[in-house]
Interface confidence: medium
């Protein structure tokens, strides 16, 4: 069936420019590999604020990942993950912005650190949520578990911890099996 997939990617100051670029490359790679399928994509950068880099209707008009992500500017502030997920749930999965009422809603969150805000993500209950935690901030079990509250259950299936940003390259195959 149809899948509407949103990438919610971290733009906080702890990300180095090359790491930020690898996140963009990962999203482009996924979109290219799923270009002739029933998937639609949108992408939101989050930090202190949140920005829809492109929505579903933008994607339908121009299915070129390089063009869609060409003007992304690294925000370089905090990691307000709770607020960003609520934003995606209420402001991106909207029919007038190209979301399909019959589609399965999927959210892939990519972050390099723990949330700097708090709250709940009740608005995202009906969205399948994957979270990818990358890098040195997730070396401890305790820090890894801070991501569980953002992901669907079970955590073993929906939470993915990567040591380095290089590992993003190999993630697609694993992710495709799950989705």
């Amino acid at each position: 069936g149809n899948v509407d997939l949103v990438f919610l990617f971290d733009g906080s100051m702890s990300l180095q420019p090359d790491e930020f670029q690898k996140i963009l490359d990962f999203m482009k790679d996924v979109m290219k590999k799923l270009s002739n399928t029933s998937y639609q994509f949108a992408a939101v950068q989050f930090s202190t604020s949140y920005k829809t880099e492109f929505d579903f209707s933008d994607y339908v008009k121009r299915k070129d990942p390089d063009a869609l992500l060409k003007h992304v500017k690294h925000m370089l502030l905090l990691t307000n993950t709770f607020g960003a997920i609520n934003y995606v749930a209420t402001e991106v999965f909207r029919e007038e912005l190209g979301a399909r009422p019959d589609a399965t809603k999927v959210l892939i969150i990519i972050t390099d650190g723990e949330a700097t805000d708090s709250g709940n993500i009740d608005a995202a209950k009906d969205i399948i949520r994957y979270i990818i935690g990358i890098g040195k901030h997730f070396q401890t079990k305790e820090s890894q578990e801070t991501l569980h509250k953002f992901a669907s259950k079970p955590a073993s299936e929906f939470v993915c911890i990567l040591d380095t940003f290089e590992c993003l390259k190999d993630l697609f195959t694993e992710l495709q099996k799950k989705i």
Partner: antibody, heavy 120, light 106 residues
Framework: EVQLLESGGGLVQPGGSLRLSCAAS???????VMWWVRQAPGKGLEWVS?????????YYADSVKGRFTISRDNSKNTLYLQMNSLRAEDTAVYYC?????????????WGQGTMVTVSS | DIQMTQSPSSLSASVGDRVTITCRAS??????LNWYQQKTGKAPKALIY???SLQSGVPSRFSGSGSGTDFTLTISSLQLEDFATYYC????????FGQGTKVEIK
Amino acid sequence: EVQLLESGGGLVQPGGSLRLSCAASGFTFSRYVMWWVRQAPGKGLEWVSYIWPSGGNTYYADSVKGRFTISRDNSKNTLYLQMNSLRAEDTAVYYCANSYDFRSNAFAVWGQGTMVTVSS
Amino acid sequence: DIQMTQSPSSLSASVGDRVTITCRASQSIGSYLNWYQQKTGKAPKALIYAASSLQSGVPSRFSGSGSGTDFTLTISSLQLEDFATYYCQQSYSTPSFGQGTKVEIK
């Protein structure tokens, strides 16, 4: 051309109510966070309230919380501010504005403003 | 709340002068600083956002710089239409404005 046009201001007695409107054109209204900002005569600028694009979340400055209600009708490209229990200190020019991007809290385009005077 | 302090509160200058207005935040706000121009009886107009990005349609004589707590708005060569009040505003958290700087004709 992006335009915001406020209306609904006027003279009202303390304790009274007013409803301000802001008609938007020239941009996709339903994608933008919208704000009300006010300026008391001879004073600086103060944010009053803002609303998420879908209308799902609303926020208020402490000075107006519980008295003012922000809302929007995306089908009509219109933003509203219902002001109840008005006080003399609410006397100001009220501007609507939109944000550059979501929750950037920066104001890209402003309306021309509508004057609200609270006086007996 | 983050306090924004502008200086000077007013200044007198002549056409062609280089004018500098400063704005200081009570805590670090990264580059989340915006500048607006307001003429008497008119609505504010966006000049610069994110500390140094010029709003579309704004003349290149306006420029912004700074990050952290200290920011500057510079008008390289003052024109007649630039006499107005200028406000800085932080957008790092709930927005707050400076008290304004009035640029008057000398």
